[in-house]
């Protein structure tokens, strides 16, 4: 019988509240032996894959997804999933990225250091889940770079 894969975790460095134009890195973690990590966004079919997987500890592997210059269009919920042959994992919890204006006054929230998805699962917009795996080795040239208007 195939093993049950542990759910991945997701975190953001330097945090989940990022000034406009600054960088953020999403860190996806899973067990050793992961071939592909994928970063997804809620209610979208688009994703970003990487096979650049490093060993974070003797029992854990990780991948990093960097956005060099954050825009308002990058705000929203992100989650991770991974492929450990021959199976895809379940998705991680969602992690919400907030983008703040750089000119914010004293009431502006500070960047939250080392934020990660908590134990509570973010509800999806209906009973169905969205996104996930496609073929192996797809590389995105950019990470969700454009603005969205809802």
């Amino acid at each position: 019988q195939e093993e049950d894969l542990p759910r991945p975790s997701i975190s953001a460095e330097p945090g989940t509240v990022i000034p406009l134009g600054s960088h953020v890195t999403f860190v996806c973690r899973g067990p050793v032996g992961v071939q592909t990590f994928r970063l997804e966004r809620e209610s979208r079919s688009t994703y970003n894959d990487t096979e650049d997987v490093s060993q974070a500890s003797p029992s854990e592997s990780e991948a990093r997804f960097r956005i060099d210059s954050v825009s308002e269009g990058n705000a929203g919920p992100y989650r991770c999933i991974y492929y450990k042959p021959p199976k895809w994992s379940e998705q991680s919890d969602y992690l919400e990225l907030l983008v703040k204006e750089t000119s914010g006054g004293p009431d502006s929230p500070d960047t939250e250091p080392g934020s990660s998805a908590g134990p509570t699962q973010r509800p999806s917009d209906n009973s169905h889940n969205e996104h996930a795996p496609a073929s192996q080795g797809l590389k995105a040239e950019h990470l969700y770079h454009h603005h969205h208007h809802h």
């Epitope: 209610s43 209906n126 996930a132 795996p133 590389k139």
Partner: antibody, heavy 117, light 110 residues
Framework: EQSVESGGGLITPGGTLTLTCTAS????????MNWVRQAPGKGLEWIGY?????KTYYANWAKGRFTISKTSTTVDLKMTSLTAEDTGTYFC??????????????WGPGTLVTISS | ELDMTQTPASVSEPVGGTVTIKCQAS??????LAWYQQKPGQPPKLLIY???RLASGVSSRFGGSGSGTEFTLTISDLECADAATYYC????????????FGGGTEVVVK
């Protein structure tokens, strides 16, 4: 690599029908597997897709009446409470090229479903 | 709710001519747009993805452009074999959509 739909045919209104998409040359669990339909002489209509550990997503109009499921080599589309408006050709299509599950690069030939009394 | 509007519904051009088809999204989809070609009795064929990238094996006579909400498919040096119906499809959102495809454009080659 190819996919082939089966299970179409003549069904009476109110009935239930399950279509099957059989893949060869690739593993459906590694891809977004979409169902798309086309009424006679009309345009393409996206139904939904399945991926990973049986995660699904559906068009608004398909929620509740259509269910997509899979095994390691097949993807099923179960349709309930069928009406004449559901008549058409049903396609299974593989998504995932270019980092989107909705970029459909491999299509089956389709299977015709006719709802009539 | 995201909707895709495609124009014109039909266009006729002579062999060697150029056809331009437009697709409009009701909200920004960045460059996440695909174009398909469908001939009678056949399944659709992916032509272009990410607004301007040619799918494998597709002739360079097909070109895509645009971003945000406005997109264009251009078929240059028309051939008889290009007679088909062409569909755009938003390839980003899977939540709160009625249909990911535009209504289609029939291309007649004279």
């Amino acid at each position: 690599e190819q996919s082939v739909e089966s299970g179409g045919g003549l069904i009476t209104p109110g009935g239930t029908l399950t279509l099957t998409c059989t893949a060869s040359g690739f593993t459906v669990t590694r891809y977004y597997m979409n169902w798309v339909r086309q009424a006679p002489g009309k345009g393409l209509e996206w139904i939904g897709y399945i991926y990973a550990s049986s995660k699904t997503y559906y068009a608004n109009w398909a929620k509740g009446r259509f269910t997509i499921s899979k095994t390691s080599t097949t993807v099923d589309l179960k349709m309930t409470s069928l009406t004449a408006e559901d008549t058409g050709t049903y396609f299974c299509a593989r998504g995932g090229v270019g980092n989107s599950g909705l970029n459909l690069d491999l299509w089956g030939p389709g299977t015709l479903v006719t709802i009539s009394s | 709710e995201l909707d895709m509007t495609q124009t014109p519904a039909s266009v006729s051009e002579p062999v060697g001519g150029t056809v331009t088809i437009k697709c409009q999204a009701s909200q920004s989809i960045g460059s996440w747009l695909a174009w398909y070609q469908q001939k009678p009795g056949q399944p659709p064929k992916l032509l272009i993805y990410q607004a301007s990238r040619l799918a494998s094996g597709v002739s360079s006579r097909f070109g895509g452009s645009g971003s945000g909400t406005e997109f264009t498919l251009t078929i240059s040096d028309l051939e008889c074999a290009d007679a088909a119906t062409y569909y755009c499809q938003q390839a980003e959102y899977s939540g709160d959509v009625e249909n990911t495809f535009g209504g289609g454009t029939e291309v007649v080659v004279k």
